[in-house]
Amino acid sequence: IFPLAFFIYVPMNEQIVIGRLDEDIILPSSFERGSEVVIHWKYQDSYKVHSYYKGSDHLESQDPRYANRTSLFYNEIQNGNASLFFRRVSLLDEGIYTCYVGTAIQVITNKVVLKVGVFLTPVMKYEKRNTNSFLICSVLSVYPRPIITWKMDNTPISENNMEETGSLDSFSINSPLNITGSNSSYECTIENSLLKQTWTGRWTMKDGLHKMQSEHVSLSCQPVNDYFSPNQDFKVTWSRMKSGTFSVLAYYLSSSQNTIINESRFSWNKELINQSDFSMNLMDLNLSDSGEYLCNISSDEYTLLTIHTVHVEPSQETASHN
């Protein structure tokens, strides 16, 4: 299995390889097979990455930053493969690598441009700050700087704040949006153009539900087909907002098909789950169950948030007793 990296062919013996932070990659290089093979990989024409001649590695002059991180495909060298297997790439490894191959027949040099991208799975969070409601799209570690776009009811929003902190390796980005008093649906897209990877967060507010004490409530949560792929691992979490913080009622992991329920009155329909319907029931409502309920369906490529507001009112009996 080849490590995650893809090659873009460009003219003049130069290829572009795109790798992900901390993953392994292959810098490709091939030559016309011949005897007495010599292979030297260099970085930015200065630093010795890997040397092979007389049938074995010679790493005495290897730059320390490459120690224990490089190897060749030794069984393939006689077939003209001088590719370099490169472990755990970092952003500092970005740049131009030159592969020098000498044989009894000829000497060739190939250039490979390594670009490294980072895209730790972003998240969409719903937060209450005093009387304001915010949606926050954030990504803990991303490189290069991503493109973040917001839409309200499928219409792009021009103004969007971006709070950015840069570390040695990458950016950490928060993009908050004030949605106080809005009933619209919102979508946030974060795109890493280098890794050609896009993540989407979608937030939908459902109509408020009024229920009487002791009744049960059914809250819907179905993924939008545009984003949802049942083959992909995902997690579903139902939580309830109480005094500004969410407490988890239940969650479901698609990988293990496990359901964990923290609230005895909560129920999930197994058959509906198998049809990718994560609607839930909350039985025997009491007044303290009033509040906001959040269904979060998340995978590496999306987060779908559905908010329900439930108002539980005293039943007639309870009212007459008072």
Epitope: E36, V38, Y53, Y100, G102, A104, V107
Partner: antibody, heavy 120, light 106 residues
Framework: QVQLVESGGGVVQPGRSLRLSCAAS????????MHWVRQVPGKGLEWVAL????????YYADSVKGRFTISRDDSKNTLFLQMSSLRAEDTAVYSC?????????????WGQGTQVTVSS | DIQMTQSPSTLSASVGDRVTITCRAS??????LAWYQQKPGKAPKLLIY???SLKSGVPSRFSGSGSGTEFTLTISSLQPDDFATYYC????????FGQGTKLEIK
């Protein structure tokens, strides 16, 4: 075709210096390690010095270490040997030699050589 | 340092003869050995590399064999153009030439 032409030889007194040059043509000079090899007429061959294809490493025979310096100018396709503190035993024909590859390989092309005579 | 002992130092032979020149290394050099031919007033010419690989363009009557410490250069049928001095070169650790074998007409 590969051509290596040495120059700069001559008669020099012991203790003095001399700089040999080698003009290379017919190949991509920067892709190959280069060497200097000397031969006393009627006697055997002795390897003198090596410079890697990229100039990053240089090696010398014990007999010349600390006195001779090998260098290259890839933009001019030229190899140099700076010889100082010359001794009578350095008298020889000095040949510029191309290695088949980058360093520590066999020699595949030789120049005709330039005579260096160290004598008072 | 690795010493190379070449024998014989002089070899008299006739056209059509099969001749063998030997090179012995003071320690193992694997197969990192080359053979050169030099004619008076000329630069040495590569014949064999890596003990037994024939350089492109060199006549097939030349062959090399051996590994470790014992190596031979064989000319299967001497031609008039083959009378010259032959040198072995070890390139396993730095470089050392043999003293040379002068091949002359008997």
């Amino acid at each position: 075709q590969v051509q290596l032409v040495e120059s700069g030889g001559g008669v020099v007194q012991p203790g003095r210096s001399l700089r040999l040059s080698c003009a290379a043509s017919g190949f991509t000079f920067s892709n190959y390690a280069m060497h200097w090899v000397r031969q006393v007429p009627g006697k055997g061959l002795e390897w003198v010095a090596l410079i890697w294809y990229d100039g990053s490493e240089k090696y010398y025979a014990d007999s010349v270490k600390g006195r001779f310096t090998i260098s290259r100018d890839d933009s001019k396709n030229t190899l140099f040997l700076q010889m100082s503190s010359l001794r009578a035993e350095d008298t020889a024909v000095y040949s510029c030699v191309r290695e088949y590859s980058s360093g520590w390989g066999y020699f595949d092309y030789w120049g005709q050589g330039t005579q260096v005579t160290v004598s008072s | 340092d690795i010493q190379m002992t070449q024998s014989p130092s002089t070899l008299s032979a006739s056209v059509g003869d099969r001749v063998t020149i030997t090179c012995r290394a003071s320690q193992s050099i694997s197969s990192w050995l080359a053979w050169y031919q030099q004619k008076p007033g000329k630069a040495p010419k590569l014949l064999i590399y890596k003990a037994s690989s024939l350089k492109s363009g060199v006549p097939s009557r030349f062959s090399g064999s051996g590994s470790g410490t014992e190596f031979t250069l064989t000319i299967s049928s001497l031609q008039p153009d083959d009378f010259a001095t032959y040198y072995c070169l070890q390139y396993n650790s730095y470089y050392t030439f043999g003293q040379g074998t002068k091949l002359e007409i008997k």
